[in-house]
């Protein structure tokens, strides 16, 4: 098959409103530059400065800088996954790329040309994938996870996930890997999604799917997009394995009732 499982509806991070900002600790006293925390973070933290190690899951590089593997890095993908990139001058990166790239192709070939490729700066939209950082002493976020609901980081052990409730019964879930397989598919999807959200440089504006799970890790019968202001989110009904049930949807004008199904 072309793919394994679906992402489902989009759930965006909570806005950085006054309540969220009130929960922030004071920003570090000595900082060359303050930037927002990675992921859904609303609070301010120190930007990484030129020459500091960086990667997909570390804090952001400062303005005008871009995280890149060192030029002589034999395993550039691995370097970024492991937080062994370096914050370098973004314009220098562009100049180097222009120097290294072949001449632009002839007109008519442009649709798949090198020139069409987005340069993917640190400000590009993203939600990341492979979470690991080699050396905790270089990466203060090594033992933290982004909390979606309140938009701030919470201490946890190694990569043990600390969930907060987001209309999902996550509080009683243990994240120990030995117990993980005892839970249903919704729980596994949620944990994998939250793993994606750890140690991010930036947040995808398209958001991330956080499914609505019951305590056993199966899908609750009613799944909804979040409300947008006064506009109610789109809702639909699923079975315990997350498969949508035909005929049970609402465009927001009226509530959807998911009858004769598993636990809500």
């Amino acid at each position: 098959g072309a793919s394994s499982a679906g992402l489902g509806p989009v759930v965006r991070c909570e806005p950085c409103d006054a309540r969220a900002l009130a929960q922030c600790a004071p920003p570090p006293a000595v900082c060359a530059e303050l930037v927002r925390e990675p992921g859904c973070g609303c609070c301010l933290t120190c930007a990484l400065s030129e020459g500091q190690p960086c990667g997909i899951y570390t804090e952001r590089c400062g303005s005008g800088l871009r995280c890149q593997p060192s030029p002589d890095e034999a395993r550039p993908l691995q370097a970024l996954l492991d937080g062994r990139g370096l914050c370098v001058n973004a314009s220098a990166v562009s100049r180097l790329r222009a120097y290294l790239l072949p001449a632009p192709p002839a007109p008519g070939n442009a649709s798949e040309s090198e020139e069409d490729r987005s340069a993917g700066s640190v400000e590009s939209p993203s939600v990341s994938s492979t979470h690991r950082v080699s050396d905790p002493k270089f990466h203060p976020l090594h033992s933290k996870i982004i909390i979606i609901k309140k938009g701030h980081a919470k201490d946890s052990q190694r990569y043990k996930v600390d969930y907060e409730s987001q209309s999902t019964d996550t509080q009683n879930f243990s994240s120990e890997s030995k117990r993980e397989t005892e839970y249903g598919p919704c729980r596994r999807e949620m944990e994998d999604t939250l793993n994606h959200l750890k140690f991010l440089n930036v947040l995808s504006p398209r958001g991330v799917h956080i499914p609505n799970c019951d305590k056993k890790g199966f899908y609750k019968k009613k799944q909804c997009r979040p409300s947008k202001g006064r506009k109610r989110g789109f809702c639909w009904c699923v079975d315990k394995y997350g498969q949508p049930l035909p005929g049970y949807t609402t465009k927001g004008k009226e509530d959807v009732h998911c009858y004769s199904m598993q636990s809500k």
Epitope: S3, Q68, L81, V127, S128, S129, T130, R132, Y159, S204
Partner: antibody, heavy 118, light 112 residues
Framework: QVQLQQSGAEVKKPGSSVKVSCKAS????????TSWVRQAPGQGLEWMGG????????EYAQKLEGRVTITVDESTNTAYMELSSLRFEDTAVYYC???????????WGQGTLVTVSS | EIVLTQSPLSLPVTPGEPASISCRSS???????????LNWYLQKPGQSPQLLIY???RRASGVPDRFSGSGSGTDFTLKISRVEAEDVGVYYC?????????FGQGTKVETK
């Protein structure tokens, strides 16, 4: 529903190049490692290389270095794999795959058969 | 690069019976964060591979609980508690610890 949709089968002559596309839909693209994996007839899986669009960073398997180029167009969420100086032994099904949360390929394209024949 | 060696290469199975596949790595796949970066895939005839197990023991979404993974360091095992007819195909282990990511040679599982 996350889907990786690949371009159609190709028949190429030895020494020529082929460019296969992989369009991602329904999910997030920018910081996943989009990889290319190939499978010769009756053989196993071989990782060819990958790209992280957000960092515009690529890495290739050593045996293919210099012949393979992986690029992306983030505006269309499409990854491309170009293989040059084709040889008979490059005849294979080429898959694009997205590395998920913990260095595993959670989504695969349907595969593109590239036949190198004179 | 890390070399993965699977055994057996061919495994005739009887539906309802258990089955086991081994994957040995040329170096430890245990990361300093405590995770073993070893994944298992099943490629059914004529299809793309599909993820079964990641991080040595975590079942991917939608994978039946008859599949389980175990092991740490260099030795890993995929077990099927009760083989079903739909489980036939080629099983691959893959390491995601370091690039280049590499696969085992594959184990062909077919019914007797």
């Amino acid at each position: 529903q996350v889907q990786l949709q690949q371009s159609g089968a190709e028949v190429k002559k030895p020494g020529s190049s082929v460019k296969v596309s992989c369009k991602a839909s329904g999910g997030i693209f920018s910081t996943y490692v989009t990889s290319w994996v190939r499978q010769a007839p009756g053989q196993g899986l071989e990782w060819m290389g990958g790209i992280i669009p957000m960092f515009d960073t690529t890495e290739y398997a050593q045996k293919l270095e210099g012949r393979v180029t992986i690029t992306v167009d983030e505006s269309t969420n499409t990854a491309y794999m170009e293989l040059s100086s084709l040889r008979f032994e490059d005849t294979a099904v080429y898959y694009c795959a997205r590395a998920g949360g913990l260095s595993h390929f959670d989504y695969w394209g349907q595969g593109t058969l590239v036949t190198v024949s004179s | 690069e890390i070399v993965l060696t699977q055994s057996p290469l061919s495994l005739p199975v009887t539906p309802g019976e258990p089955a086991s596949i081994s994957c040995r790595s040329s170096q430890s796949l245990l990361h300093s964060n405590g995770n073993n970066y070893l994944n298992w895939y099943l490629q059914k005839p004529g299809q793309s591979p599909q993820l079964l197990i990641y991080l040595s023991s975590r079942r991917a979404s939608g994978v039946p609980d008859r599949f389980s993974g175990s092991g740490s360091g260099t030795d890993f095992t995929l077990k099927i508690s009760r083989v079903e007819a739909e489980d036939v195909g080629v099983y691959y282990c893959m390491q995601g610890l370091q690039t280049p990511w590499t696969f085992g040679q594959g184990t062909k599982v077919e019914t007797k």
